[in-house]
Amino acid sequence: MMCLECASAAAGGAEEEEADAERRRRRRGAQPGAGGSACCGARGVGGAGVVSADEEVQTLSGSVRRVPSGLPSIPSTPGCAAAAKGPSAPQPKPASLGRGRGAAAAILSLGNVLNYLDRYTVAGVLLDIQQHFGVKDRGAGLLQSVFICSFMVAAPIFGYLGDRFNRKVILSCGIFFWSAVTFSSSFIPQQYFWLLVLSRGLVGIGEASYSTIAPTIIGDLFTKNTRTLMLSVFYFAIPLGSGLGYITGSSVKQAAGDWHWALRVSPVLGMITGTLILILVPATKRGHADQLGGQLKARTSWLRDMKALIRNRSYVFSSLATSAVSFATGALGMWIPLYLHRAQVVQKTAETCNSPPCGAKDSLIFGAITCFTGFLGVVTGAGATRWCRLRTQRADPLVCAVGMLGSAIFICLIFVAAKTSIVGAYICIFVGETLLFSNWAITADILMYVVIPTRRATAVALQSFTSHLLGDAGSPYLIGFISDLIRQSTKDSPLWEFLSLGYALMLCPFVVVLGGMFFLATALFFLSDRAKAEQQVNQLVMPPASVKV
C-alpha cells in the first residue's frame, strides 16, 4: 500500500505559494489582516487543494474562513481592503500551461508511478519469493522493511543534494540506479536471499532520490493553482503505482510463467523514463527565498524550529496518527495478498503453492482495490470534511479520527470474513482501505493550519521521517516475525500458516485505533494551536524588530 508522502509533500509545495502571495503583498505595502498570514493570505494545502488569494482557505475539502474561533476577529485595515479590491491586487492569471512544462510534469508523474510500481511488485510476487528462496514470513517482511529503512535514511540526504546540485541529473541517475539494481535482482540464485534483501535496500536509496527531488522541480515549473494541480497529479501516482505494482507482479508472472520476469518490467520502463527526464525536463532555477522566509530564517535555527514543532501538540499527535496509518498500510499492503491466498487454501478454493506462479489472482484484485480506494479515500475524506466544517471547526482531526476508528472495524472484519468468504474479505478491505486513505489530504491540511509557513518544510520532512520510522519501516517485518513466532509456539500446518498471519495482522487494527485516538487528541488542541500559529504569522509580517518566534 501507499505511504503518506502523498499529502505531506504536496503540502510542502503549497507552502511556497503562500510565500509567493505574501511576498507580493509585502511589495505592495499591504497590511496584515485578520487571523491569517495576511489579510488575503492563501493557505497551502495538500492533496488536491486549490490556493486562493482570498481570505478563505481553498482546500481539497472546501473553503474555510481563516479566523479561528476563540480569537476576536480583527477588522481589516483600509490598506488591506485596498489590497484585496483595488487594481493593485494580484489578479489570478489563467493557467498558461506550456506544452514543454506539461510534458515535463507528466514524465515526472510517470516516474512516480514507476517508483511505486517497482516498490509493490515485490509484494505482488511475495509468495513466489518465499517459495523460491525458502524463507519464512519474517524473511519476506524484511524485504519491505529494508527498502523503507534505506529510503527513509536516504531521503534527507537527497533533499540536501537536491538543493545544491543538478536535480535533473540526480533524478535520472536515481532512476537508472534502481532500475539496474531491480533488473539484476531478478537473477539472484535461490541460495543468496541476503543479496535480494541488499538489492531492495539499494533500490530504496535510488527511489529516495526521486521522491525528494521530483516535487521540487514541479514546484519550480509551475505557480499558484497550476502548481497545486500538478503536485496533486504527481501524488495521485502513489495509489495508482502501488496498485499497478500488484497487478504487474501477478499478471507478468502468469504471462511469462516465471515470477522473475515481474522484476524486469519496471526497470525497462525506468530506463526509458530516466532518459526522457534527461531530454524533456527543463533545468529549472530554484525558487528564490521570499522576504518573509528570509526574515524568519535569520532569527530561527533548525534546532529552534524542531523545538517549536515538538511543543506543538496538534502537530505531534497528528504525526503520531500519520505513523499509525503508515504502519497499517505498510503491513497490510505487504501481507494481505498472501493472507488471502492462505485463506483460500484453508477454504479449499486454492491449493497450497509449491511451484510458482503463486497467488496471482489475489495480488491482481488487491492491486485494483488499492488503486481505486486511493482515489476514493481522498475524495471521501475531502467531502466529509467539507460537510463537517459547516458544523464544527474541529472537523479536520475529527473526520480523520472517525475514518481511522471506522477503518479499524473493517480491518478486524477482514480476518473474520476470510475464514468463510473471500468476497466478504475483499469488501471489508475495500471499505477499510477507503476509510484509512480518507485522511491523506486532511492530514496535510492540519499541518498547514497549526504550523507557520516558514516552518512547514521542516514539519513536512519530520512528519514524513517519523511516519516511516514508527510506521512502515518496521511493520512488514514485525508482522512476519509475529506470524513465525505464533507458528513456532503452536504448529506448522496449512491452517496455522493462515491463522498465525491473521493473528499477527490483528496488530494493525489496534495500531489504527491508536491512530484514531491520536487524531482525537489532535482535535483537543487543534483550535488553540491554530490560533497560536496565526498569531505568530501576524507577528511575522510586522517590522523585523518586533518579530517573535
Epitope: E351, N354, P494
Partner: antibody
Framework: QVQLQQSGVELAKPGSSVKISCKAS????????ITWIKQTPGQGLEYIGY????????YYNEKFKGKATLTADKSSSTAFMQLSSLTPDDSAVYFC???????????WGQGVMVTVSS | DDIVLTQSPALAPSLGQRATISCRAS??????????MHWYQQKPGQQPKLLIY???KLASGIPARFSGSGSGTDFTLTIDPVQSDDIATYYC?????????FGAGTKLELR
C-alpha cells in the same frame, strides 16, 4: 488433484533400515506438507509426522521419534521416509498423504507394505 | 495428552436406510471458529479417502448422501441412503492438537 506415487513392497530383516519414497505429480499446485501414516490391523491409523517440502521443516509424533526420518527432494518432488532399527512391530502399511485445508489428509498414496521378519 | 477419538465399532444398516456413525473426542476439537474433525472412508486393500472436512463440509467428488455434523466433542457422519458401494471402514480424525489422531474405525456392513 495431486497424485502421490509410492514405492513398492519392502521386505526387511530386524535391525535393518528401509527407505520408502512418495513422488508427487499432477497439479503443479501441490501441498507443501507431506505426511506419513502407519496402518496396522491392531493399532489402526497412526500419524507419524510431516515434512514441509518448502522449508524442509519436520514434525514427528513423539512415538515415532528415532524410528522415522523424513526428508524431501524438491527438484524431483519426492518425499522420503527412512525407518531404522526395524522390529516385527514395524510391519505395517505406510501411507504418504498431503496435508491441506484445515489440516486434513486430502490426497493419499497407495501405500507401501513393509514386512519385517528374519 | 493426545486427543482420543472413540468410534462405535460396527454398523449394519439395510440398503437404502440411513446410517449414522458417531465419533466422540476426549476434549473439544473446536478452535478459531473451526471444528477440526474430518471423516475418511477406506475400502479393503485401498488407501483412505477424504469424505468430510471441518466437521460438515463435503470434500470434492463426494456424493451428497454423505453429510457430517457436530461441534466441540461429539460428531456424526450420516449416510442417507446407504448403497452397496458404501461398504467400508470409516475413520474420524482430529487436527486440533499434535499429534493428529484417528478413531479406531467403524466397519459398515450391510444387513
Amino acid at each position: 488433484q495431486v497424485q502421490l506415487q509410492q514405492s513398492g513392497v519392502e521386505l526387511a530383516k530386524p535391525g535393518s533400515s528401509v527407505k520408502i519414497s512418495c513422488k508427487a505429480s499432477g497439479n503443479t499446485f501441490t501441498s507443501n506438507y507431506i505426511t506419513w501414516i502407519k496402518q496396522t490391523p491392531g493399532q489402526g491409523l497412526e500419524y507419524i509426522g510431516y515434512i514441509n517440502t518448502g522449508s524442509g521443516k519436520t514434525y514427528y509424533n513423539e512415538k515415532f521419534k528415532g524410528k522415522a526420518t523424513l526428508t524431501a527432494d524438491k527438484s524431483s518432488s519426492t518425499a522420503f521416509m527412512q525407518l531404522s532399527s526395524l522390529t516385527p512391530d514395524d510391519s505395517a502399511v505406510y501411507f504418504c498423504a498431503s496435508l491441506t485445508g484445515v489440516d486434513y489428509f486430502d490426497d493419499w498414496g497407495q501405500g507401501v507394505m513393509v514386512t519385517v521378519s528374519s | 495428552d493426545d486427543i482420543v477419538l472413540t468410534q462405535s465399532p460396527a454398523l449394519a444398516p439395510s440398503l437404502g436406510q440411513r446410517a449414522t456413525i458417531s465419533c466422540r473426542a476426549s476434549q473439544s476439537v473446536r478452535m478459531s471458529g473451526y471444528n477440526l474433525m474430518h471423516w475418511y472412508q477406506q475400502k479393503p486393500g485401498q488407501q483412505p479417502k477424504l469424505l468430510i472436512y471441518d466437521a460438515s463440509k463435503l470434500a470434492s467428488g463426494i456424493p451428497a448422501r454423505f453429510s457430517g455434523s457436530g461441534s466441540g466433542t461429539d460428531f456424526t457422519l450420516t449416510i442417507d441412503p446407504v448403497q452397496s458401494d458404501d461398504i467400508a471402514t470409516y475413520y474420524c480424525q482430529q487436527s486440533k492438537d499434535d499429534p493428529y489422531t484417528f478413531g479406531a474405525g467403524t466397519k459398515l456392513e450391510l444387513r
